[in-house]
């Protein structure tokens, strides 16, 4: 479900002769006027809509937080795309902030995955090869992590 699907400014288009099942909707990059007759453009760099809609207002563009870089700006049809700065990542269960990546693995573990903007370094036990999920108590070695490239829209 997108942010737009949950938007509160839904309206019922006024009853009138309909030319198609979707009359009363406006294209991406627009919202509908209060009387339901016109489509009004979102304001470039300020707000957006991503789907055909009957929103009374476009959705406000996200501003990237400090600790994030802007991968692509907000357009009238797409929200800003923000990414954690190098050396930090955003977890699925705590998407509101970027957290620092660990610099190395605990004793008895080896690094098998680098720090990326969406994941911490990945460590596995030397012998068993099983992943380690807890916090690192003591660090055996310091490994500089390298950032990844894929982007994800800010939430």
């Amino acid at each position: 479900i997108t942010q737009q699907d949950l938007a509160p400014q839904q309206r019922v288009a006024p009853q009138q002769k309909r030319s198609s099942p979707s009359e009363g909707l406006c294209p991406p990059g627009h919202h509908i006027s209060e009387d339901g007759r016109d489509c009004i453009s979102c304001k470039y760099g300020q707000d957006y809509s991503t789907h055909w809609n009957d929103l009374l207002f476009c959705l406000r563009c996200t501003r990237c937080d400090s600790g994030e870089v802007e991968l692509s700006p907000c357009t009238t049809t797409r929200n800003t795309v923000c990414q954690c700065e190098e050396g930090t990542f955003r977890e699925e269960d705590s998407p509101e902030m970027c957290r620092k990546c660990r610099t190395g693995c605990p004793r008895g573990m080896v690094k098998v995955g680098d720090c990326t903007p969406w994941s911490d370094i990945e460590c596995v036990h030397k012998e068993s090869g099983t992943k380690h999920s807890g916090e690192a108590p003591a660090v055996e070695e310091t490994v500089t992590s390298s950032p990844g490239t894929p982007a994800s829209p800010c939430s």
Epitope: P21, P28, Y44
Partner: antibody
Framework: QVQLVQSGAEVKKPGASVKVSCKAS????????LHWVRQAPGQGLEWMGW????????KYNEKFKDRVTITADKSTSTVYMELSSLRSEDTAVYYC????????????WGQGTLVTVSS | DIQMTQSPSFLSASVGDRVTITCRAS??????VAWYQQKPGKAPKLLIY???TRHTGVPDRFSGSGSGTDFTLTISSLQPEDIATYYC?????????FGGGTKLEIK
């Protein structure tokens, strides 16, 4: 490359109807909105309405709403504009044009179809 | 409906001149304005959208500016092939409307 090819010139009598076609090629038909814009001789441009093949959305300029009908045949990637109850002031070149699902400017245009209304 | 008033209606200039065409909207249209070039017997061609963004393949001698109600199309150095009629269009609110056009000719 993107092409919008329109049907040929028409001469009609007042009160009659005309149906102009616009065949699209060179892009995915269901991803762009197609519009009709007209231009009377020596005059400016006037937006008439749109059709979006992706969800069959149609929107008309209120000025033409009672007389214009826009339809499409997705199997041939063709959009049609029918204008009824023709009068002499409907004499114009009728263009189809497309725009992305976003800002309402037109990046490609058909070659135009001259419709002459004369008794 | 929003009225788009273009000026001048006719403009005569020499090759190499800097040419400016203005367009005034009857109400605020933010930056939702496009400019088109139309040569006789041909369909319009998109030059500028969002008031100042040049369309793909448009020479950089064409530039646009403005926001709110006042907009400008500038040709920095007029070329013979620029002889045409130019139209502004607001794409802020339906029905989308066009200016009356500016016919540009060589002195």
């Amino acid at each position: 490359q993107v092409q919008l090819v329109q049907s040929g010139a028409e001469v009609k009598k007042p009160g009659a109807s005309v149906k102009v076609s616009c065949k699209a090629s060179g892009y995915t038909f269901t991803e762009y909105i197609l519009h009709w814009v007209r231009q009377a001789p020596g005059q400016g441009l006037e937006w008439m309405g749109w059709f979006y093949p992706g969800n069959n959305n149609i929107k008309y300029n209120e000025k033409f709403k009672d007389r214009v009908t826009i339809t499409a045949d997705k199997s041939t990637s063709t959009v049609y504009m029918e204008l009824s109850s023709l009068r002499s002031e409907d004499t114009a070149v009728y263009y189809c044009a497309r725009h992305e699902q976003g800002p309402g400017y037109f990046d490609y245009w058909g070659q135009g179809t001259l419709v002459t209304v004369s008794s | 409906d929003i009225q788009m008033t273009q000026s001048p209606s006719f403009l005569s200039a020499s090759v190499g001149d800097r040419v400016t065409i203005t367009c005034r909207a009857s109400q605020d249209v933010n930056t939702a304005v496009a400019w088109y070039q139309q040569k006789p017997g041909k369909a319009p061609k998109l030059l500028i959208y969002w008031a100042s963004t040049r369309h793909t393949g448009v020479p950089d001698r064409f530039s646009g500016s403005g926001s709110g109600t006042d907009f400008t199309l500038t040709i920095s150095s007029l070329q013979p092939e620029d002889i045409a009629t130019y139209y502004c269009q607001q794409h802020y609110i339906t029905p989308w409307t066009f200016g009356g056009g500016t016919k540009l000719e060589i002195k």
